[in-house]
């Protein structure tokens, strides 16, 4: 079947081959910095992985085995010779971002393992994917009246319902731990984050261990990159100088057909700290063209909260590789500057491994104070990562993509 | 090579329990989702849920929630799944199917187990 | 089943055989598909992921696409192989799990 992943063990055919697109809950991973358990499903098989044993009470899992040691193969085991989490990046495919479920929910994807969920706090914080379910119980799920799981909290802090969608790589890096709600039914939070679609079909191995993604990464997709994110120690002062910089000028999207209408509605409104994501599955299966369409994101410096409503942004199916392109805006808060470097939103045509396993979102948020915006992505790579410095909104897309796809156990 | 083996066929009596076994190989066992799909004879593809291998974390259809429990032992990289309350509706073939990392579906499947209520 | 396809299609070999599975907007609507062949007495084997991506050793003969809430698979150059039964599947936001579509059987 496919060509197995460079890095992955004898992932004999496709198995490292498939784009991620559409997955949702399907398994995918969120982190939850904070929480506990927060499972570090981006983390792909890495050597470190040491399953969490079943004994102890995995999020979301209803049932998890007391007597599963981790084996050798599964804890030590290189996974799959995935090298570092970049490097399977790098051989992982560009997985469509997931449509509405996260993979963690839909069972696809890399498996996040509960103690990556405890190492939450791991800065580097793969994107745990977490079913919507929070890997748990369906019926666990804390949703908004639409039955979507709606994420009111700061990123920081998971909302009880939610559940990591598909990679959602809530890491709040150190935000005050918002109110960590435990993922609803012990399913991994979905923070809606969908960017990296480490499709739960693998469990992530723990957050704070090495995270050689231990899914086989398909060799014939795109390197993913590893998306750091990285926030810049805040301190009070420094934020609110930021939140006073002139709006940046969000990539117009314009031209992106598919159905990421979505980020029409995304308020960006710093200032107060609030940070009200709701999510909506993210479909952005058709996003064909080049994104252009963030154009109606208003980005409202002073304010207080932030809302951002994604509905679905409907990468689902082919997002396909032309994300890469996120790679150069940086948000320079401080003074204004504010430097785009390049705004090609564009999507790649299937930017399918890079959101959801592929680029593993690392975030990192040297000392944060106080600070509870949300983290950035940032070096989310070409092959559909988003490379987003300073960038709210990419960045709640990007988790809201990857969100979803750990619902499908992917 | 990934392969997926399954456990032989069991012949149950209805209020039983049946328990299958899906033994793995060929990669890293806790780095993917295990699914469970049943096929009654004649019939078409049925979800009934998936394990994350790695954490233990289940996910069941809801159609089965209350009967089924799935299980895994990574020491030697197996998972299970145990179906209570058989009906003679229950008869079918059971497989095991790992969730695709990187794409959306099953990659690859075990031969599966024909449980005979 | 949530997912509807044709219980049947046939074709001569070298036709072209197109399978329809048609969903709502909480499954196919909004999420990827994948496609599976299962040969008589086997396991099915994923033949298309995420709508259209063929896993390695797929003849490209098998091509899938996805519009709306509609999924179809295509079968160029049928072969006498290709007799099988055919199951498109997806994640189900409303149901919260994957469903299948009832299958087709392709005759040659």
């Known amino acids: 079947m496919a060509e197995p992943r460079q890095e992955f063990e004898v992932m004999e055919d496709h198995a490292g081959t498939y784009g991620l697109g559409d997955r949702k809950d399907q398994g995918g991973y969120t982190m939850h910095q904070d929480q506990e358990g927060d499972t570090d499903a981006g983390l792909k098989e890495s050597p470190l992985q040491t399953p969490t044993e079943d004994g102890s009470e995995e999020p979301g899992s209803e049932t998890s085995d007391a007597k599963s040691t981790p084996t050798a193969e599964d804890v030590t085991a290189p996974l799959v010779d995935e090298g570092a989490p970049g490097k399977q990046a790098a051989a992982q495919p560009h997985t469509e971002i997931p449509e509405g479920t996260t993979a963690e929910e839909a069972g696809i994807g890399d498996t996040p393992s509960l103690e990556d969920e405890a190492a939450g706090h791991v800065t580097q914080a793969r994107m745990v994917s977490k079913s919507k379910d929070g890997t748990g119980s369906d019926d666990k799920k804390a949703k908004g009246a639409d039955g979507k799981t709606k994420i009111a909290t700061p990123r920081g802090a998971a909302p009880p319902g939610q559940k990591g969608q598909a990679n959602a790589t809530r890491i709040p890096a150190k935000t005050p731990p918002a109110p960590k709600t435990p993922p609803s039914s012990g399913e991994p939070p979905k923070s809606g984050d969908r960017s990296g679609y480490s499709s739960p079909g693998s469990p992530g191995t723990p957050g704070s261990r090495s995270r050689t993604p231990s899914l086989p990464t398909p060799p014939t997709r795109e390197p993913k990159k590893v998306a750091v994110v990285r926030t810049p120690p805040k301190s009070p002062s420094s934020a609110k100088s930021r939140l006073q910089t002139a709006p940046v000028p969000m990539p117009d999207l314009k031209n992106v057909k598919s159905k990421i209408g979505s980020t029409e509605n995304l308020k960006h409104q710093p200032g107060g700290g609030k940070v009200q994501i709701v999510y909506k599955p993210v479909d952005l299966s058709k996003v064909t063209s080049k994104c252009g369409s963030l154009g109606n994101i208003h980005h409202k410096p002073g304010g207080g909260q932030v809302e951002v409503k994604s509905e679905k942004l409907d990468f689902k199916d082919r997002v396909q590789s032309k994300i890469g392109s996120l790679d150069n805006i940086t948000h320079v808060p401080g003074g204004g500057n504010k430097k785009i470097e390049t705004h090609k939103l564009t999507f790649r045509e299937n930017a399918k491994a890079k959101t959801d396993h592929g680029a593993e979102i690392v975030y990192k948020s040297p000392v944060v104070s106080g600070d509870t915006s949300p983290r950035h992505l940032s070096n989310v790579s070409s092959t559909g990562s988003i490379d987003m410095v300073d960038s709210p909104q990419l960045a709640t897309l990007a988790d809201e993509v990857s969100a979803s796809l750990a619902k499908q156990g992917l | 090579q990934v392969n997926l083996r399954e456990s032989g066929a069991e012949v149950k009596k209805p209020g039983a329990s049946v328990k299958v076994s899906c033994k793995v190989s060929g990669y890293t066992f806790t780095g993917y989702y295990m699914h469970w799909v049943r096929q009654a004879p004649g019939q078409g593809l049925e979800w009934m849920g998936w394990i994350n291998s790695n954490s233990g974390a289940t996910k069941y259809a809801q159609k089965f929630q209350g009967r089924v429990t799935m299980t895994r032992d990574t020491s030697i990289t197996t998972a299970y799944m145990e179906l209570s309350s058989l009906r003679s509706d229950d008869t079918a073939v059971y497989y095991c199917?790992?969730?695709?990392?990187?794409?959306?579906?099953?990659?690859?499947w075990g031969q599966g187990t024909l449980v005979t209520v | 089943y949530v997912l509807t396809q044709p219980p049947s299609a046939s074709g001569t070999p070298g036709q072209r055989v197109t399978i329809s599975c048609s969903g709502g907007?909480?499954?196919?609507?909004?999420?990827?598909v994948s496609w599976y062949q299962q040969l008589p007495g086997t396991a099915p084997k994923l033949l298309i992921f995420?709508?259209?991506q063929r896993p390695s050793g797929v003849p490209d003969r098998f091509s899938g696409s996805k519009s709306g809430t509609s999924a179809p698979l295509a079968i160029s150059g049928l072969q006498s192989e290709d007799e099988s039964d055919y199951y498109c599947?997806?994640?189900?936001?409303?149901?919260?799990?994957?469903?299948f579509g009832g299958g087709t059987k392709v005759t040659v």
């Open positions: 199917a790992r969730g695709a990392r990187d794409g959306y579906g099953f990659d690859y």
């Open positions: 599947a997806t994640w189900d936001d409303s149901l919260n799990g994957w469903v």
């Open positions: 995420t709508n259209d």
């Open positions: 907007s909480s499954n196919i609507g909004s999420n990827a």
